[in-house]
C-alpha cells in the first residue's frame, strides 16, 4: 500500500513539475527591465526564451519573436536546449510511469517489469528536473554577469554614439516557476526510485516442497522457494518429527550445493 502511494504521489508531483517546466519555457517573463528614467513614458520591457515584449504605461503591449538564431547569445541557446531536453525527458518519463503504476493493470505485466519501468521513469524525472534547474540557473547567471558589465559598455558608432541604457534588471516570474517546477520534478523522480525498491520482487516467496536426503535420515519440509537464494534446506541434518510443518521464515536455512528437488 505504501509503495503504491509513494509511486502515485511521485507520479503526480512529477506531472505538476513537468507542467511547470513547460509553462516556464513558454513564459515571456524570464528577465524584466523597468525603464524608470525614460523621458517619454514608463516602459516595462520583458524577455522570454522565444520573444521580447514591451509594455507602456498607456497599456500598449507588443511582443516580437527572435526570428534569427545567429544573433542570439550562446547562453540563451543553451538554456533553450536544456529546457527542451527537460520537457522531452519528462514527457517520456510520464508515459513510461503511467504503464509502471501499480494501480493500473496491463495484461500480465509482472512486478519486476513494473519495477524497472518505475526506476526508468524516476531517473528520467530526476534528469528532467536537473535540466530545468540548470537551464534556469544558467539564465539567471547570464543576467547577473551581463548587467554588472553594462555600465562600462559605451562606444561611438558611425557619426553618433551607442551606449547601454541603465535599467533595473530583475529576475522574471518564469525563473521562479522553473526553479520550483524543476525541484518538484526532481522530488517526484526520487519518489519513483524509492517506490521501485518496494516493487522489486527481492524476497518473493513461492511455496514449494523441498526434499533433503542426507544419509538415512529424510526430512520433509514444506519450505519456501526463494527466487534469489535457491532452495531452502535443513542444513543441520536434524530430523523434523514434531509434525508442525514450518515455513522457511521459521527455520533459518542456508543454500547448499547438495540440495535438490
Amino acid at each position: 500500500m505504501a509503495v503504491t502511494a509513494c509511486q502515485g504521489l511521485g507520479f503526480v508531483v512529477s506531472l505538476i513539475g513537468i507542467a511547470g517546466i513547460i509553462a516556464a519555457t513558454c513564459m515571456d517573463q524570464w528577465s524584466t527591465q523597468d525603464l524608470y528614467n525614460n523621458p517619454v513614458t514608463a516602459v516595462f520591457n520583458y524577455q522570454g526564451l522565444w520573444r521580447s515584449c514591451v509594455r507602456e504605461s498607456s497599456g500598449f503591449t507588443e511582443c516580437r519573436g527572435y526570428f534569427t538564431l545567429l544573433g542570439l547569445p550562446a547562453m540563451l541557446q543553451a538554456v533553450r536546449a536544456l529546457m527542451i531536453v527537460g520537457i522531452v525527458l519528462g514527457a517520456i518519463g510520464l508515459l513510461v510511469s503511467i504503464f509502471a503504476l501499480k494501480c493500473i493493470r496491463i495484461g500480465s505485466m509482472e512486478d519486476s517489469a513494473k519495477a524497472n519501468m518505475t526506476l526508468t521513469s524516476g531517473i528520467m524525472f530526476i534528469v528532467s528536473g536537473l535540466c530545468a534547474i540548470a537551464g534556469v540557473s544558467v539564465f539567471a547567471n547570464m543576467l547577473v554577469t551581463n548587467f554588472w558589465m553594462s555600465t562600462a559598455n559605451m562606444y561611438t558608432g558611425m557619426g553618433g554614439m551607442v551606449q547601454t541604457v541603465q535599467t533595473r534588471y530583475t529576475f522574471g516570474a518564469a525563473l521562479f516557476v522553473g526553479w520550483v517546477a524543476g525541484g518538484l520534478t526532481l522530488i517526484g523522480g526520487v519518489m519513483m526510485c524509492i517506490a521501485c525498491r518496494g516493487l522489486a520482487p527481492e524476497e518473493t516467496n513461492y511455496k514449494a516442497v523441498s526434499y533433503h536426503a542426507s544419509g538415512h535420515s529424510v526430512a520433509y519440509k514444506p519450505g519456501g522457494f526463494k527466487a534469489s537464494t535457491g532452495f531452502g534446506s535443513n542444513t543441520k541434518n536434524k530430523k523434523i518429527y514434531d509434525g508442525g510443518a514450518r515455513t522457511e521464515d521459521e527455520v533459518q536455512s542456508y543454500p547448499s550445493k547438495h540440495d535438490y528437488v
Epitope: V43, V54, E56, F60, G71, P73
Partner: nanobody, 121 residues
Amino acid sequence: QVQLVESGGGLVQPGGSLRLSCAASGNIFRIDTMGWYRQAPGKQRELVAGISRGGTTTYAHSVKERFTISRDNAKNTMYLQMNSLKSEDTAGYYCNAQAWDPGTFRYLEVWGQGTLVTVSA
C-alpha cells in the same frame, strides 16, 4: 549595429516651417522610444519631443502647440514637424532611440550625429 541618420535641417526664416526626419538602420530588433533633443551653443542638451512605440508623446513646454512628433514603426523612422519657428529654436537637433538588442540582451541608447537648424532673418 544600429545607426541613426537625421535629415531636413537648414536655414529658415522666423515663423517658417521645417520637417526633420530620423531614420534608423542596421541590425534592428525593436526600437521602443525615440526622441528629438537639441543643443544650442553653450547650452545643455534638452529633450524637444519624444514618442513611444505605442504612440505616447511628450513635448518640452517651449515647443508645445508648435512642434509635432510622429513615427513610422514599420520603417523605423521618426519625424518632427516644426512650425512657427523662432530664433531661440536655433540649435543642433539630435535623434535618440532606445532599442532592445537580443544579441547582448541589453537596452541600447543610440544617438544620431545631428542636423543643424538655423532660424534667422
